[in-house]
Interface confidence: medium
């Protein structure tokens, strides 16, 4: 038995990456630990070295292949183990039966760009990265806009309940600097969660025309 409470959480990016975080109260210090992935029907297995991210948690990425290759599907069950070196042997610290498409977290959207900007509105587009063809159109997005004098946490969330890789932001203030972020989530999967937020896209609305009301 492992001393202290242990938490082992992993997500699949839907293509060729499983990211894992292992947290352990009273974990062993100065010990080499790794995550080992054994798919039950594939002809490969994979290991990654757990690196500390805080006092009692470690993380690593299992790189399963080329970024856009479909390495796992809904049929797969992957046995994931945390193994820590104990003298000359490896000790199993945590184990889980991992169903990739029940534990999805996609990569953050990329290639954000301003398609068209006016005084009060801005049209922005983006692309999804390394998302499985299996989702077809079964994705949703959340977006947020950072206004001057506010924080990201205060920004209201805009929800797009379909695979729509653009948005038209309305009721903006002329000649004002804004930042925009978007994240994506598949509709599938009991434990699926939102992707990280995209890199912020900075843009500025056009100034109002002279002599006109704003």
């Amino acid at each position: 038995a492992v001393n202290g409470t242990s938490q082992f959480t992993c997500f699949y990016n839907s293509r060729a990456n499983i990211s894992c975080v292992w947290s352990q109260d009273g974990a062993l210090q100065d010990t080499s630990c790794q995550v080992h992935a054994w798919p039950d029907r594939r002809r490969w297995n994979q290991t990654c070295e757990l690196l500390p991210v805080s006092q009692a948690s470690w993380a690593c990425n299992l790189i399963l292949g080329a970024p856009d290759s479909q390495k796992l599907t809904t049929v797969d069950i992957v046995t994931l183990r945390v193994l820590c070196r104990e003298g000359v042997r490896w000790r199993v610290m945590a184990i889980q039966d991992f169903k990739p498409f029940e534990n999805l977290r996609l990569m953050a959207p990329i290639s954000l760009q301003v398609v068209h900007v006016e005084t009060h509105r801005c049209n922005i587009s983006w692309e999804i990265s390394q998302a499985s063809h299996y989702f077809e159109r079964h994705l949703e997005f959340e977006a947020r806009t950072l206004s001057p004098g506010h924080t990201w946490e205060e920004a209201p969330l805009l929800t797009l309940k379909q695979k729509q890789e653009w948005i038209c932001l309305e009721t903006l203030t002329p000649d004002t600097q804004y930042e925009f972020q978007v994240r994506v989530k598949p509709l599938q999967g009991e434990f699926t969660t939102w992707s990280p937020w995209s890199q912020p896209l900075a843009f500025r609305t056009k100034p109002a025309a002279l002599g006109k009301d704003t």
Partner: antibody, heavy 120, light 107 residues
Framework: QVQLQQSGPGLVKPSQTLSLTCAIS??????????WNWIRQSPSRGLEWLGR?????????DYAESVKSRITINPDTSKNQFSLQLNSVTPEDTAVYYC??????????WGQGTMVTVSS | DIQMTQSPPSLSASVGDRVTITCQAS??????LNWYHQKPGKAPELLIY???QLETGVPSRFSGSGSGTEFTFIISSLQPEDTGTYYC?????????YGGGTKVEIK
């Protein structure tokens, strides 16, 4: 060699529950390398996979969306068998039902099949 | 869900003939395709797994090929006992799905 022996009634009334059992010999239902499946076959639907149960570090189940709200597949380790329960049956559930072992991504061992008719 | 389209639905050939059946998947399934043979009143029997691997004990006149979305099953020299229905099955995504079958008869 591995064999699967099916048992259960051939006639079920509409709205009742269809129950079938698949007894395993020569393998273990709780083995770490196989999955245990139910498939049905009818003239209208052809071969249709219904679901599976399997043990890795715990028991797992996967079901076809078309029957997900009505189906249960349970292992019985003491008898080395697994069962199918399909609730609220209709005449559309009339079919030959098969149990099968999946080993290395293919159904290599099948039960003999049970013809189930849903009729009042 | 992945649709499997099998053709032809039926065929009639003479003993010794070369028989070809094709199976098309609605999306890429790598090489996770199996072929089964079913006699009337019997359960299907596995012939080929992983698109091209011959199951133990299956005669070498049966072969399979293909990857991605297009797959082919060949009986190099048809024998009387080969009558029945042949099915392809994808094993890359849940729900597992089957082709509609090809009924093979002897002329």
């Amino acid at each position: 060699q591995v064999q699967l022996q099916q048992s259960g009634p051939g006639l079920v009334k509409p709205s009742q529950t269809l129950s079938l059992t698949c007894a395993i010999s020569g393998d273990s239902v709780s083995g770490n390398s196989a999955t245990w499946n139910w498939i049905r076959q009818s003239p209208s639907r052809g071969l249709e996979w219904l679901g599976r149960t399997y043990y890795r570090s715990k028991w797992n189940h996967d079901y076809a969306e078309s029957v997900k709200s009505r189906i249960t597949i349970n292992p019985d380790t003491s008898k080395n068998q697994f069962s199918l329960q399909l609730n609220s049956v209709t005449p559309e559930d009339t079919a030959v039902y098969y149990c099968a072992r999946d080993s290395k991504s293919a159904f290599d061992i099948w039960g003999q099949g049970t013809m189930v008719t849903v009729s009042s | 869900d992945i649709q499997m389209t099998q053709s032809p639905p039926s065929l009639s050939a003479s003993v010794g003939d070369r028989v070809t059946i094709t199976c098309q998947a609605s999306q890429d399934i790598n090489n996770y395709l199996n072929w089964y043979h079913q006699k009337p009143g019997k359960a299907p029997e596995l012939l080929i797994y992983d698109a091209s691997q011959l199951e133990t004990g299956v005669p070498s006149r049966f072969s399979g090929s293909g990857s991605g979305t297009e797959f082919t099953f060949i009986i190099s020299s048809l024998q009387p006992e080969d009558t029945g229905t042949y099915y392809c099955q994808q094993y890359d995504w849940l729900p597992l799905s089957y082709g509609g079958g090809t009924k093979v008869e002897i002329k």
